[in-house]
Interface confidence: low
């Protein structure tokens, strides 16, 4: 999906609003340094698809983000803001059903959170930062 | 209304330093970033580097490394570049801009510099 | 870096032509691309960013398209104050890179 279309400050509203402190929610009780960002974005579509991969697309060790709160308010976000995104998501949405919800927080869970955390807020003031 | 104004014309001698200021207005000066832009006379574009109001962090272009010092006063939405060890080929204008993803939707009117001997 | 090269250099046109003024990157940059207009003693003037969203309150003459390395910018009808300098520039990370530009004259 090409985001280039995205209101941006809309979706920006939203995760002010609402995603942010979901992502804080799910993250509670782990220190802000425990993990390094390795993924980065450089201007907010770039960050949009990377945002959009590491809450939808399960990984190894990690695969049921797309059912928790922030995600379910990220999709919503892109759905509104995004023209035509609804509809690239509706074979994606199909298989996501079929998953079972997840029982425990793991680790790399936790780790991927962060990476989205990271992203989040470089989606708010767009630009490489290289380390 | 956005509006970057910049500095007055400058004449330098080589080897000396000069800095152009950029006074921004009608945003707010810490949400955007600010990058400056060479253009010799009778050339093309030259992208130098950008500095963020919000952190001042820096990031430059590798050939304005150690030629180009970017630095802001938040205090009076003012952003300066002072380029320094002058020579014939610093002659240019040089315009900032400000951005939010790459690429510059207001420009200051160009400053231009002129080094001669 | 990434390198834009801009083609033509320079054309001559007569009002009321379509114009098409190309632009070709070194490497992916998706739609990472905007377009400026410049005159002399001038500063520059964006036209088209994201490669095709057109910038506040240029006419709709003036269109972009493309994605990838390859990339157009048109203006449908020219018209005597478009008669200017245009140059690309890739915004897909740093360093930001220009084209050379492109001089559009009249005929």
């Known amino acids: 999906y090409d985001f280039t279309n995205c209101d941006f400050e809309k979706i920006k509203a939203a995760y002010l609003s609402t995603i942010s402190k979901d992502l804080i929610t799910y993250m509670s009780g782990t220190k802000s340094t425990e993990f390094n960002n390795t993924v980065s974005c450089s201007n907010r579509p770039h960050c949009l698809t990377e945002i959009q991969s590491l809450t939808f697309n399960p990984t190894a060790g990690c695969a049921s983000l797309a059912k928790e709160m922030f995600a379910m308010k990220t999709k919503a976000a892109l759905a509104i803001w995004c023209p035509g995104y609804s509809e690239t998501q509706i074979n994606a949405t199909q298989a996501m059903k079929k998953r079972r919800k997840r029982k425990v927080t793991t680790n790399k869970c936790l780790e991927q959170v962060s990476q989205l955390q990271g992203l989040w807020r470089r989606f708010n003031r767009p630009l490489l930062k290289q380390q | 209304q956005v509006q970057l104004v910049q500095s007055g014309a400058e004449v330098k001698k080589p080897g000396a330093s000069v800095k152009v200021s950029c006074k921004a207005s009608g945003y707010t000066f810490t949400s955007y970033w600010m990058h400056w832009v060479k253009q010799a006379p009778g050339q093309g574009l030259e992208w130098i580097g950008v500095i963020d109001p919000s952190d001042t962090y820096t990031t430059y272009n590798q050939k304005f490394k150690g030629k180009a010092t970017l630095t802001v006063d938040t205090s009076t939405s003012t952003a300066y570049m002072e380029l320094s060890s002058l020579r014939s080929e610093d002659t240019a204008v040089y315009y900032c801009?400000?951005?939010?993803?790459?690429?510059?939707?207001?420009w200051g009117q160009g400053t231009l510099v002129t080094v001669s001997s | 870096d990434i390198q834009m090269t801009q083609s033509p250099s320079s054309l001559s046109a007569s009002v009321g032509d379509r114009v098409t003024i190309t632009c070709r990157a070194s490497?992916?940059?998706?739609?990472?691309l905007a377009w400026y207009q410049q005159k002399p003693g001038k500063s520059p003037k964006l036209l088209v960013y994201?490669?095709?969203r057109p910038a506040a309150g240029v006419p709709s003459r003036f269109s972009g398209s493309g994605s990838g390395t390859d990339f157009t910018l048109t203006i449908s009808s020219l018209q005597p104050e478009d008669f200017a300098t245009y140059y690309c520039?890739?915004?897909?990370?740093?360093?930001?890179?220009f084209g050379q530009g492109t001089k559009v004259e009249i005929k």
């Open positions: 994201f490669a095709r």
């Open positions: 520039q890739h915004h897909y990370d740093t360093p930001w890179t």
């Open positions: 801009t400000r951005s939010l993803d790459g690429f510059f939707d207001y």
């Open positions: 490497e992916n940059i998706y739609s990472y």
